[in-house]
């Protein structure tokens, strides 16, 4: 059988080989499609209810004015020419519909490195056969279940038209230190060959690098945190993340009532300033991160400064924020 591919809604003409070009003709068409059970016979003489779907033209060809999904199947013509020679034509008709350009909906503007993120949902409407959706990163195909990539797919069929709607939700786990502006796109590949893929417009979410806890560095001057009475201690909270987070300070696990600042200065140290200090970096996009704690202690003249002083009183003494 000769394979014929026809677009849904378009007309189709199937030639009856060997048929006389005009009546009288001895020919018959046989159809076995979604509209028939077994075979339906159509002849040049018989105009009727089937004419809206398929009718025999004066030249013996079969004319389908608007091909539908139910017209998929086998079409056969048997014709006899003026000399009594019989010729058979055999067609296998498959139909297709190209959907509208796929779109990425619910797309993320920002992804977080190191954790799974929903990038977006690719939607294609009105295809037949269903076809497939695939995702691309920087122009290269993304393989599901590899390197933190997962895809959730859904296929629905319109109850009246029989056309398909495809949905594909992409989840990725961006690597730390990777591309800060990856380019994602999605493409629809038709279920029938010889039709090119349709690609969405690309999306370029930003990748945000969360600052791990150990990266919130607390630097103490003098080193070790041991200082003579009346001396000055400078605590600096270093956070490499951009944009700069808000820094708050804690003493002995209690927030200090001070405005946010990356530097805390303790001038004229007294016993009440002794204790354990830490800083807390608060990012707009996720929760707070606390630094390691350091002990501030007073050493009497002649003593060796300990690396970790004992916890002192709870008084704040005099604090200065840089």
């Amino acid at each position: 059988a000769q394979n014929i591919t026809a677009r849904i809604g378009e007309p189709l003409v199937l030639k009856c080989k060997g048929a006389p070009k005009k009546p009288p003709q001895r020919l018959e068409w046989k159809l076995n499609t979604g509209r028939t059970e077994a075979w339906k016979v159509l002849s040049p003489q018989g105009g009727g209810p089937w004419d809206s779907v398929a009718r025999v033209l004066p030249n013996g060809s079969l004319f389908l004015p608007a091909v539908g999904i139910q017209d998929e199947g086998i079409f056969r013509c048997q014709a006899m020419n003026r000399n009594g020679k019989e010729t058979k034509s055999n067609y296998r008709v498959r139909v297709y519909q190209i959907p509208g350009k796929p779109e990425i909906v619910d797309s993320a503007s920002e992804l977080t490195a190191g954790v799974p993120n929903k990038v977006g949902t690719c939607v294609s409407e009105g295809s037949y056969p269903a076809g497939t959706l695939s995702w691309h990163l920087d122009g290269k195909p993304l393989v599901p279940n590899e390197k933190g990539v997962s895809v959730k797919e859904q296929t629905r069929r319109h109850p009246e038209t029989g056309l398909f709607t495809l949905q594909s939700e992409l989840m990725v786990t961006p690597a730390r230190g990777g591309d800060p502006r990856p380019t994602f796109s999605c493409s629809f590949s038709p279920g029938l060959p010889r039709h090119r893929a349709l690609r969405t417009a690309p999306i370029q979410p930003r990748v945000w690098e969360p600052v791990p806890l150990e990266e919130v560095q607390l630097v103490v001057e003098p080193e070790g945190g041991a200082v003579a009475p009346g001396g000055t201690v400078t605590l600096t909270c270093e956070v490499p993340a951009q944009p700069s987070p808000q820094i708050h300070w804690m003493k002995d696990g209690v927030p200090l009532p001070l405005p946010p600042s990356p530097v805390l200065i303790l001038p004229e140290i007294g016993p009440q300033d002794q204790g354990t200090y830490s800083c807390v970096a608060t990012h707009s996009s996720h929760g707070p991160q606390e630094s390691r704690a350091v002990s501030i202690s007073i050493i009497e003249p002649g003593e060796e400064g300990p690396t970790a002083g004992s916890v002192g009183g709870s008084g704040l003494g005099t604090l200065a924020l840089a």
């Epitope: 059970e37 339906k40 018989g46 105009g47 009727g48 209810p49 089937w50 809206s52």
Partner: antibody
């Protein structure tokens, strides 16, 4: 609301002519074949004529062929039945109905119009 | 031409009864048979299309089935409003042919 309304029925003498009309509303008229069906008093239903959506092809049973003509005006959403050489046996209620092909067959009907052929 | 032989031509039944009406086509018409209900002085109303499909707004007590060239309309539990005349229609070929009708009366 999908609606079909027939008009034009009445009393006519044998050999006379009558033109029936059917006004369609509530659907895209030129997407559908249309059909006339009749019912003689106390009898069953009988197909009279069908026309395809463009109006290019018309279909009749032998009982009315060459006497009746079905036509349509898609711009006016109207279906017509021109009846000539009327006989007593044409007396019936005439219904217009949507469809008539294998895709849609007589899913919506008008209320009917009575044609009486009598001297 | 295709003949549609409908039986019975009339039947008497009571509310709640199961009623079956059949049409036999004289040749293969595929699935292209409809069933209609008609009440006195009213236009026919399509109940079943393409042999087995329930038309919009039709109660589920109506159903259609097909076995070869035999087509059946079943009313599972007859209701007072179901007393009417029922017709089958073949629309696979011209001339379109109706069955002779079945009048369902109150017993």
């Amino acid at each position: 609301e999908v609606q079909l309304v027939e008009s034009g029925g009445g009393l006519v003498q044998p050999g006379g002519s009558l033109r029936l009309s059917c006004a369609a509303s509530g659907f895209t008229f030129n997407n559908y074949w249309m059909t006339w069906v009749r019912q003689a008093p106390g009898k069953g239903l009988e197909w009279v004529a069908s026309i395809d959506n463009s109006g290019d092809n018309t279909y009749y049973p032998d009982s009315v062929k060459d006497r009746f003509t079905i036509s349509r005006d898609n711009a006016k959403n109207s279906l017509y039945l021109q009846m000539n050489s009327l006989r007593a046996e044409d007396t019936a209620v005439y219904y217009c109905a949507r469809g008539g092909d294998i895709l849609v067959s007589l899913d919506v009907w008008g209320q009917g119009t009575l044609v009486t052929v009598s001297s | 031409d295709i003949q549609m032989t409908q039986s019975p031509s009339s039947l008497s039944a009571s509310v709640g009864d199961r009623v079956t009406i059949t049409c036999r086509a004289s040749q293969d018409v595929g699935i292209y048979v409809n069933w209609f209900q008609q009440k006195p002085g009213k236009a026919p109303r399509r109940l079943i299309y393409r042999a087995t499909n329930l038309a919009d707004g039709v109660p589920s007590r109506f159903s259609g089935s097909r076995s070869g060239t035999d087509f059946t309309l079943t009313i599972s539990s007859l209701q007072p409003e179901d007393f009417a005349t029922y017709y089958c229609l073949e629309f696979d070929e011209h001339p379109l042919t109706f069955g002779g009708g079945t009048k369902v009366e109150i017993k």
